[in-house]
């Protein structure tokens, strides 16, 4: 019996009846055994078939077998109800071998030409299975030439049988206080040949409660307890189960904080498995009662281990724990059923004693010394000499613990000195220097430091003066001896002030004319304002209307008098403003250089002379009365003039202050 070629040679070929294409003889029996490599099968088809037809092919036939199974018995030329001819059919071996048997009986009624067939080996697709047959692989089947292999979805591993996918379902640890766990793929059928271990591990003090929910379906046996698949629950105290079948197990109160759930499956069956919802409980803590003026959040029916609550105080109250104020308070329930910290109190906010107001006072409106939430205080400034800047002085103790004005300001109000007050009432023109009386020129400042000079008080900690008067001390401000509140130059009774810093106008050039002859002295302390010490006002925008030609200004100082000596008593002189062109012309002739009088200067005095400021008056204020506000303001600063004070046809020259308002305001606001 001829065999097919041995692999790895190519497995293919031709078979034919003896004598083909001629007629076959009687009493012939021929057998072929074809063998393909493992993982392959044999395919066979006929190109010619002409055998004697007989009932059930008893006479002549070709029989195809694979192993013990007969694939076909063939005869005739065409199939009938009871006999089969191959026609265009293709035949496949069941395994890797195919037996072909040809037989003819003792006679033929007419000549028959037999058959011709061709065969070849081809790969078996093991992944293709007939309907109703078990799949080759659990999850994924991969065919290849000569064989196949199986693989698994994520979360599974191929069993050693190379076909089944076992679930990777161990090592899951549940640490939340409640949760759900189920068999793999639930509610679809669970995997075969798997061993799953789940752990619930809660903090000590918790007790796990297990509830089986929805459905329960684990392969069982009518006589033996869970021999195939089973679920077991283990705690440090006891074991529950095994469980199988279709009935939901009852709730399990484990009284343990750790639970191990084991689920084992065998190689067969088609069951949906189980689902567990677990919760936990613990010894409850005492119900928290909110302190007066406070509330608890969140509100719960009970509080157990790890539960927490916070206390929030009503507006105007703050948390106090024993002795200490707290920003926030949260207590946590412990495993022994006690809270980890004691309940705080909600104490009314106390803004504390209000700050003292310089040059002012504070009055308790709500009640003597009451400084708690919603208490009201009233600040006021010392009358006559101070006025409150910006707000009305009413402050309320707010929930943030700050005294707050009606405008929402947390800073103190400011008592600003009233400027330009004088005891002097202006009368008709006074010819010649006059002795000043107390309170006439309360802004007058005496500056000693090498030479005698003057200045005018601005606010309560600045002095306006001439640059040339303090130029030598610009780098040694502390050398300036500043006196105020006195009329007598040599009197021991005066208010002493000291300089913190000297600011000379950047446009002033010493010994090169007197343009920008202006300076500010910052005092190192505020002075107390009274009838003898009051600041002069700075000119308003409208002030020029009170400083036109022939308008009267007043200069004061301790400078040289007609007798040629420094005045012992403060003197003053009322002098008219001189037309600017007229003044410019007066100082055009030698010994004065051209352009001595600039637009930053104003002139005052009598054409006939006799009334003037003089050496020692430098830096003092030339003041004017603002008839609308009834306050005195500084229009000029004593700067320079003719060598002979009070000379006819010559005038006193003063720094024009209104030109320097921005400079003054910038210095004061910056420093």
């Amino acid at each position: 019996t001829p065999l097919g070629p041995k692999w790895p040679e190519p497995v293919f070929g031709r078979l034919a009846s003896p004598g083909f294409p001629g007629e076959y003889a009687n009493d012939q029996e021929r057998r072929w055994t074809l063998t393909a490599p493992p993982g392959y099968r044999l395919r066979l088809y006929f190109t010619h078939f002409d055998l004697e037809l007989s009932h059930l092919c008893e006479y002549d036939f070709v029989k195809l077998s694979s192993g013990a199974k007969v694939l076909a018995t063939l005869c005739g030329q065409e199939s009938t109800d009871t006999e089969r001819a191959p026609g265009k059919d293709t035949f496949y071996s069941l395994g890797s071998s195919l037996d072909i048997t040809f037989r003819s009986d003792y006679s033929n009624e007419k000549p028959f030409t037999g058959f011709e067939a061709f065969y070849a080996a081809e790969d078996i697709d093991e992944c293709q299975v007939a309907p109703g047959e078990a799949p080759t692989c659990d999850h994924h089947c991969h065919n290849h030439l000569g064989g196949f292999y199986c693989s698994c979805r994520a979360g599974y591993v191929l069993h050693r049988n190379k076909r089944t996918c076992s679930a990777l379902c161990s090592g899951q640890v549940f640490t939340q206080r409640s949760g759900e766990l189920s068999s793999p793929e639930y509610p679809r059928p669970y995997p075969k040949l798997s061993s799953c271990t789940y752990s619930i591990s809660l903090e000590e003090g918790f007790s796990v409660i297990l509830d089986f929910v929805e459905s329960f379906d684990v392969e069982t046996h009518p006589e033996t307890l869970c021999p195939y698949d089973f679920l077991k629950i283990q705690t440090d105290r006891e074991e529950h189960g095994p469980f199988c079948g279709k009935t939901l197990p009852h709730r399990i109160e484990t009284k343990s904080n750790t639970v191990t759930i084991t689920f084992v499956t065998d190689e067969s069956g088609d069951h949906t498995g189980w689902k567990i919802h677990y919760t936990s409980t613990a010894q409850p803590c005492p119900y928290p009662m909110a302190p007066p003026n406070g509330h608890v959040s969140p509100v719960q029916a009970k509080y157990i281990l790890k539960d927490s609550f916070s206390i929030f105080c009503e507006t105007g109250y703050e948390l106090l724990q024993g002795h200490l104020p707290l920003k926030s308070f949260t207590a946590v329930c412990q495993k022994d059923g006690s809270w980890d910290r004691p309940m705080p109190a909600c104490s009314i906010v106390d803004c504390g004693p209000p700050d003292d107001l310089p040059s002012g006072r504070v009055e308790y409106i709500t009640g003597p010394g009451v400084t708690t939430y919603k208490a009201v205080i009233q600040y006021s400034c010392e009358e006559t000499f101070y006025t409150m800047k910006v707000n009305d002085g009413k402050y309320v103790c707010e929930a943030d613990g700050f005294w707050t004005s009606s405008k929402g300001e947390k800073s103190l109000p400011v008592c600003e000195p009233v400027c330009g007050l004088s005891a002097r009432t202006t009368g008709g023109r006074i010819y010649g220097g006059q002795k000043a009386k107390p309170g006439d020129f309360p802004w007058q400042v005496l500056i000693l430091g090498g030479t005698t000079a003057a200045g005018a008080l601005l606010y309560d900690n600045w002095v306006l003066t001439a640059a040339h008067a303090v130029y030598e001390q610009k780098h040694d401000a502390s050398a300036l001896d500043i006196r105020m509140g006195t009329l007598k130059r040599l009197s021991p009774h005066y208010t002493q002030a000291w300089s913190e810093a000297v600011f000379i106008h950047e446009g002033y050039t010493h010994d090169a004319g007197f343009d920008n002859d202006i300076a500010l002295i910052k005092l190192n302390n505020k002075v107390v304002i009274n009838s003898n010490i009051t600041p002069i006002c700075l000119p308003r925008k409208e002030a020029e209307s009170f400083m036109r030609t022939d308008d009267i200004g007043t200069a004061s100082g301790w400078g040289l008098t007609q007798r040629g000596f420094l005045a012992r008593n403060l003197m003053y002189v009322d002098i008219p403003i001189v037309d600017h062109q007229k003044c410019t012309a007066a100082y055009e002739k030698p010994p004065y250089p051209r352009g001595s009088v600039t637009a930053n200067m104003l002139c005052a005095g009598l054409e006939s002379g006799g009334k003037d400021s003089c050496r020692g008056d430098s830096g003092g204020a030339l003041v004017f009365l603002d008839s609308e506000t009834e306050r005195w303001f500084v229009g000029g600063i004593v700067s320079w003039g003719s060598m002979n004070c009070g000379e006819a046809g010559q005038y006193g020259v003063y720094t024009k202050v209104i030109n320097y308002i921005p400079w003054i305001e910038n210095i004061i606001s910056d420093f």
Partner: antibody, heavy 122, light 107 residues
Framework: EVQLQQSGPGLVKPSQTLSLTCAIS??????????WDWIRQSPSRGLEWLGR?????????DYAISVKSRITINADTSRNQFSLQLNSVTPEDTAVYYC????????????WGQGTLVTVSS | QPGLTQPPSVSVSPGQTARITCSRD??????VSWYQQKPGQSPVVVMY???KRPSGIPERFSGSNSGNTATLTISGTQAMDEADYYC??????????FGGGTKLTVL
């Protein structure tokens, strides 16, 4: 205005007990708005809070963990003063010791004694 | 609890703004006080509850506290402000804890 006047020895031998007293004027030791603290200061440890006593319908004490096993703070209402006792001292306890008032509304140490330099040396 | 962390020194020119920091994890959850100590003197509280000035402390002192850092700010610093500054808070066990101190130098 609250004033605190400290008294006590400036030199203590190792292993002995350091004792200081603080007399209060301008407030009461049993005030419900105050606590009475001891704080020490040394170059090596800076400012170190040691403990306090305060009255809220009964007397309470809080102590720093570092000295808890050997510190006692007591109040004497009849004399309006409070005291510090620190047992088993070592040279490490050498410091300037301050008695201090803290305010329950502010949580701050708002009045301090003049300070007592205590040297632990044999 | 560990102490509070402060820079050892801060320098500032007169009139400028000085900022002294104090840090610890979640310090913003606590109230912070600040103390000024001049040589040979007892400390004086200059700020409490993060941003509140005791009566008599100049308005140029201000405070803030959020996250992990509290800050004491001195605007328009003066020569008289030269001193050691300490921050202080209360930890959860109601124990007082101080910073190591910052030496403020006014140049």
């Amino acid at each position: 205005e609250v004033q605190l006047q400290q008294s006590g020895p400036g030199l203590v031998k190792p292993s002995q007990t350091l004792s200081l007293t603080c007399a209060i004027s301008g407030d009461s030791v049993s005030s419900k708005r105050a606590a009475w603290d001891w704080i020490r200061q040394s170059p090596s440890r800076g400012l170190e809070w040691l403990g306090r006593t305060y009255y809220r319908s009964k007397w309470f004490n809080d102590y720093a963990i570092s000295v808890k096993s050997r510190i006692t703070i007591n109040a004497d209402t009849s004399r309006n003063q409070f005291s510090l006792q620190l047992n088993s001292v070592t040279p490490e306890d050498t410091a300037v010791y301050y008695c201090v008032k803290s305010n329950s509304g502010t949580g701050a140490f708002d009045s301090w004694g003049q300070g007592t330099l205590v040297t632990v040396s044999s | 609890q560990p102490g509070l962390t402060q820079p050892p020194s801060v320098s500032v020119s007169p009139g400028q703004t000085a900022r002294i920091t104090c840090s610890r994890d979640k310090l913003g959850d606590k109230y912070v006080s600040w103390y000024q100590q001049k040589p040979g003197q007892s400390p004086v509280v200059v700020m409490y509850k993060d941003n509140k000035r005791p009566s008599g402390i100049p308005e140029r002192f201000s405070g803030s506290n959020s996250g992990n850092t509290a800050t004491l700010t001195i605007s328009g610093t003066q020569a008289m402000d030269e001193a050691d500054y300490y921050c202080q808070a209360w930890d959860s066990s109601t124990a007082g804890v101080f910073g190591g101190g910052t030496k403020l130098t006014v140049l």
